[in-house]
């Protein structure tokens, strides 16, 4: 029996009965927040073999092992993950071992096992046999291995029953509990699963099977399940669903899930039954079950009930996220805000068409309208009094409308009005008239030449760069000395720079009047010697990174009510030199024979250039005699210290915190202070833990149902 669409068992352990007949959980399984310790021995769900999404266990008192509950759980597919994880075991106070001895495959996602104060048998499981990549696993804050005394079956009797593998250079027996080995298939099976008797399963099986080489005897399917058979692809007239089975069109048409209730139903696209058309596609008609490619960004029509949508905060802009056509009028009134330009671009940047008018007034936080980066048509079907469809009034810091070199905007009907925009040059307004096709519509008073641009340097000269020099983390640039008609009007220069992977930035990107600016700014004083060209050394830059740089002359903005000339450069793109890459990440080595080592790693996080090759060095190490001092098979010889409390925020203080044994004849020596990199890594680690914990709490704590 398939159970779904996700099972949440909380508060009452008797809810576990809901799992009674489930063989596959199509969705997630949550078992959490059961605070009263119960006896779980009478609960056993041998039918459950597959969870298609993830398994989450959190604060279940009294549960000591998962092996009795789910003795045959074989595959967790991870089709959807919980914060990148397919298996999460968090703050399980009484869990002593995981014990999922039939778990053979986690198809996608990693595992997170954290803050389980009594949990052992973690180092005895070879997760690389279950997951493709173990580098993202997070196993922290559980019972320390040296306090566990994990013994695999038969070890005490010196008749070990389990197989050995190498993890982190340690060749050891692999098991789930004191009496359950970790199953490994013969090497002859390759990537295939195997039966309990080590016979190879059919290639389409995943995890295990009840009979060899039989695609109807699989416990789970590598690809898709259809009518009792594991198939590499869904047969004709059936469609992939939830990443694991094939369904017909009728099933897909009838799905009504809590997640998709607002949509127009599931669609069939590229052989899959899915909740929505994928990115770049749209339904072929409102009630169609099929998708067609969008021409450009996919259209999303948004309508305002009250006809006019007032954007006075990020929250109100948020309502327009993803909208490409806005049916109604936009009134923009942004007086203040934090990081407002990029937030507005995030939420309004896809709007292409406004059917009514656009009015921008008292928006002192705005420097530019470039956040409406895709606006191409104002229809003016509804206009303001006086027949205005674009109205810009009293915006104290507005300097740019759009970058007219890269913008086509048409105003189909209605006039434009501009007044009391002291930093907006009239030339910018005239340019808009030409681009939008409104030239000749405006009457004389519609564009006020006195109070627009009165506090701006409107006639700009161009500053030219004269030289650029780069190193791995520095750029030196110089430019022609600017000479305004009256040298006293020139105060200084400001250099603006930022990382620019692509050559598509504009001066006003991410800039608002409330201090947010995606550009770094450096002031440069005039050189005292009039023959020396001004310049700057930009340092602390990243190697092999393209930067955008431009320079502005800082001038007195008004001389007896005459507009004066300003000056700025074009945007220059310049790349720093390459440098030594950071160290390769996640280096893992394992031995697959007596004369071979397999070494794997991930690329460095900072390549600092184009990587061309890696150098691998190795050397023989003497065997550590310390390994032979204890008989680790004798349980009573393992020193059991204090009970682990499952917290990881406080570092454990050892007996002598001041010293550590350095080996050799050196004797005790001081612990090395942590490097800045180590401190930073610790800080990031703590931050990551908090983020995950917040995500967990936000996901699982929900209002009690009626």
């Amino acid at each position: 029996e398939i159970c779904g669409p996700g099972i949440d068992i909380r508060n009452d352990y008797q809810q576990l009965k809901r799992l009674e007949n489930c063989t596959v959980i199509e969705g997630y399984l949550h078992i959490l927040l059961i605070s009263k310790a119960e006896d779980y021995r009478s609960y056993r769900f041998p039918k459950l073999t597959v969870i298609t999404e993830y398994l989450l266990l959190f604060r279940v008192a009294g549960l000591e092992s998962l092996g009795d509950l789910f003795p045959n759980l074989t595959v967790i597919r991870g089709w959807k993950l919980f914060y990148n994880y397919a298996l999460v075991i968090f703050e399980m106070t009484n869990l002593k071992d995981i014990g999922l001895y039939n778990l053979r495959n986690i198809t996608r996602g990693a595992i997170r096992i954290e803050k389980n104060a009594d949990l052992c048998y973690l180092s005895t499981v070879d997760w690389s046999l279950i997951l493709d990549a173990v580098s993202n696993n997070y196993i922290v804050g559980n019972k320390p291995p040296k306090e566990c005394g994990d013994l695999c079956p038969g070890t005490m009797e010196e008749k070990p029953m389990c197989e050995k593998t190498t993890i982190n250079n340690e060749y050891n027996y692999r098991c789930w509990t004191t009496n359950r080995c970790q199953k490994m298939c013969p090497s002859t099976c390759g990537k295939r699963a195997c039966t309990e008797n080590n016979e190879c399963c059919h290639p389409e099986c995943l995890g295990s099977c009840s009979a060899p080489d039989n695609d109807t005897a699989c416990v789970a399917c590598r690809h898709y399940y259809y009518a009792g058979v594991c198939v590499p692809a869904c047969p004709p007239n059936t469609y992939r669903f939830e990443g694991w089975r094939c369904v017909d069109r009728d099933f897909c048409a009838n799905i009504l899930s809590a997640e998709s209730s607002d949509s127009e139903g599931f669609v069939i696209h590229d052989g899959e039954c899915m909740q929505e058309c994928p990115s770049g596609f749209i339904r072929n008609g409102s009630q169609s079950m099929y998708c067609i490619p969008c021409e450009g960004p996919c259209p999303k029509v948004c309508e305002e009930e009250k006809k006019t949508k007032t954007i006075d905060s990020v929250t109100s802009a948020q309502m327009l996220q993803g909208c490409t056509i806005f049916k109604g009028n936009l009134l923009i009134n942004i007086r203040r805000g934090n990081n407002i330009a990029s937030e507005l671009e995030n939420f309004m940047g896809l709007i292409e068409v406004v059917t009514g008018y656009v009015k921008i007034r008292h928006s002192h936080a705005l420097v530019s309208l470039s956040f409406l980066k895709n606006l191409r048509l104002i229809l003016g079907e509804e206009q303001l009094e006086g027949n205005y469809s674009f109205y810009v009034l009293d915006n104290q810091n507005l300097q740019q409308l759009w970058d007219w070199d890269h913008r086509n905007l048409t105003i189909k009907a209605g006039k434009m009005y501009f007044a009391f925009n002291p930093k907006l040059c009239v030339s910018e307004i005239y340019r808009m008239e030409e681009v939008t096709g409104t030239k000749g519509r405006q009457s004389k008073g519609d564009i006020n030449t006195r109070n627009n641009g009165e506090r701006a340097s409107c006639e700009s000269d161009v500053l030219h760069f004269t030289s650029t020099t780069t190193s791995k983390n520095r750029i030196i640039i110089t430019w022609h000395r600017y000479r305004p008609p009256d040298y006293r009007d020139l105060i200084s220069f400001t250099v603006y720079y930022k990382e620019a992977p692509f050559k598509n930035v504009t001066e006003y990107d991410g800039q608002d009047a409330c201090g947010s600016n995606s550009w770094n700014m450096v002031d440069v004083d005039l050189p005292p010697n009039k023959d020396v060209e001004p310049g700057i050394l930009l340092h602390g830059l990243k190697p092999w990174t393209q930067y955008a740089v431009y320079v502005k002359a800082v001038t007195l903005t008004m001389v007896e009510n005459d507009h004066i000339r300003g000056a700025k450069s074009e945007i220059l793109y310049i790349r720093t030199n390459a440098s030594v890459p950071s160290i390769p990440l996640d280096v893992l080595s394992a031995s697959n024979s007596s004369s071979q080592l397999i070494v794997k790693w991930n690329p460095p996080s900072l390549p600092n250039g184009n990587l061309s090759y890696y150098i691998v060095r190795w050397q023989r190490q003497p065997q550590d005699g310390y390994l032979y001092r204890h008989n680790y098979c004798s349980k009573d010889k393992i020193p059991i210290r204090k009970y682990a409390d499952g917290t990881i925020d406080i570092e454990e203080v050892t007996e002598n915190p001041k010293t550590e044994v350095c080996g050799g004849e050196k004797g005790p020596c001081c612990a090395c202070p942590k490097t800045e990199a180590e401190k930073q890594a610790e800080k990031e680690e703590a931050e990551y833990r908090k983020v995950f914990e917040n995500f967990l709490h936000n996901s699982i704590f929900v209002p009690r149902p009626e």
Epitope: E1, I2, C3, G4, P5, G6, I7, D8, N21, C22, G27, D250, F251, A253, N254, I255, L256, S257, A258, E259, S260, S261, E264, G265, S286, Q287, P705, E706
Partner: antibody, heavy 117, light 112 residues
Framework: QVQLQESGPGLVKPSETLSLTCTVS?????????WNWIRQPPGKGLEWIGY???????NYKPSLKDRVTISRDTSKNQFSLKLSSVTAADTAVYYC??????????WGQGTLVTVSS | DIVMTQSPLSLPVTPGEPASISCRSS???????????LQWYLQKPGQSPQLLIY???NRLYGVPDRFSGSGSGTDFTLKISRVEAEDVGVYYC?????????FGQGTKVEIK
């Protein structure tokens, strides 16, 4: 794989309240779909009574609205029908059924409720 | 309420011969989203109803192709091209476009 099973008393006295429960296995009633009650008097046609949706909202047949309540117990994955002030005309086979976007896809096997003193 | 009227109420048929059932609604059953939620169900003796056709003409996967649905607005038809013995039972039309949802009174198909 989804199964619905009606349960409740087979005999109810006139003017009392008829109470039936539908136990769902294989699908969580909060996960989606509309969970319906339909009845069929002996030898007659089908009559839709009402539903409770995955989010707990209800819709009832107007002529029964004053007497009917459909509720749910999410912890047991069950939904229930209560029909008050019953008369002999309420004698019927009562079915629970799941409705998606476009059709009823799963039905219970039905339970006969007789209203008689 | 929308009244669904089926005709005939009884339909004796000869195996191999065609059969046709009409269903008329008292008002249009086109949903606001443009869909027409008209379904046909068959209830065999002693069983729960089973779906044959949804959205007027979509035959459910696995239903024999001798069953077909047609119609629009207020007039709908279920056709069986060649009746077989296993097709006996009561056929109901159903509208799910407007609440309250309503069934037709049913058409009993029996072998002559």
């Amino acid at each position: 794989q989804v199964q619905l099973q009606e349960s409740g008393p087979g005999l109810v006295k006139p003017s009392e309240t008829l109470s039936l429960t539908c136990t769902v296995s294989g699908y969580s009633i909060t996960g989606g779909y509309l969970w319906n009650w339909i009845r069929q008097p002996p030898g007659k046609g089908l009559e839709w009574i009402g539903y409770i949706s995955y989010d707990g909202t209800n819709n009832y047949k107007p002529s029964l609205k004053d007497r009917v309540t459909i509720s749910r117990d999410t912890s047991k994955n069950q939904f229930s029908l209560k029909l008050s002030s019953v008369t002999a005309a309420d004698t019927a086979v009562y079915y629970c059924a799941r409705y998606g976007r476009v059709f009823f896809d799963y039905w219970g096997q039905g339970t006969l409720v007789t209203v008689s003193s | 309420d929308i009244v669904m009227t089926q005709s005939p109420l009884s339909l004796p048929v000869t195996p191999g011969e065609p059969a046709s059932i009409s269903c008329r609604s008292s008002q249009s059953i086109v949903h606001s989203n443009g869909n027409t939620h008209l379904q046909w169900y068959l209830q065999k003796p002693g069983q729960s109803p089973q779906l044959l056709i949804y959205k007027v003409s979509n035959r459910l996967y696995g239903v024999p192709d001798r069953f077909s649905g047609s119609g629009s607005g207020t007039d709908f038809t279920l056709k069986i091209s060649r009746v077989e013995a296993e097709d006996v039972g009561v056929y109901y039309c159903f509208q799910g476009s407007h609440v309250p949802w309503t069934f037709g009174q049913g058409t009993k198909v029996e072998i002559k």
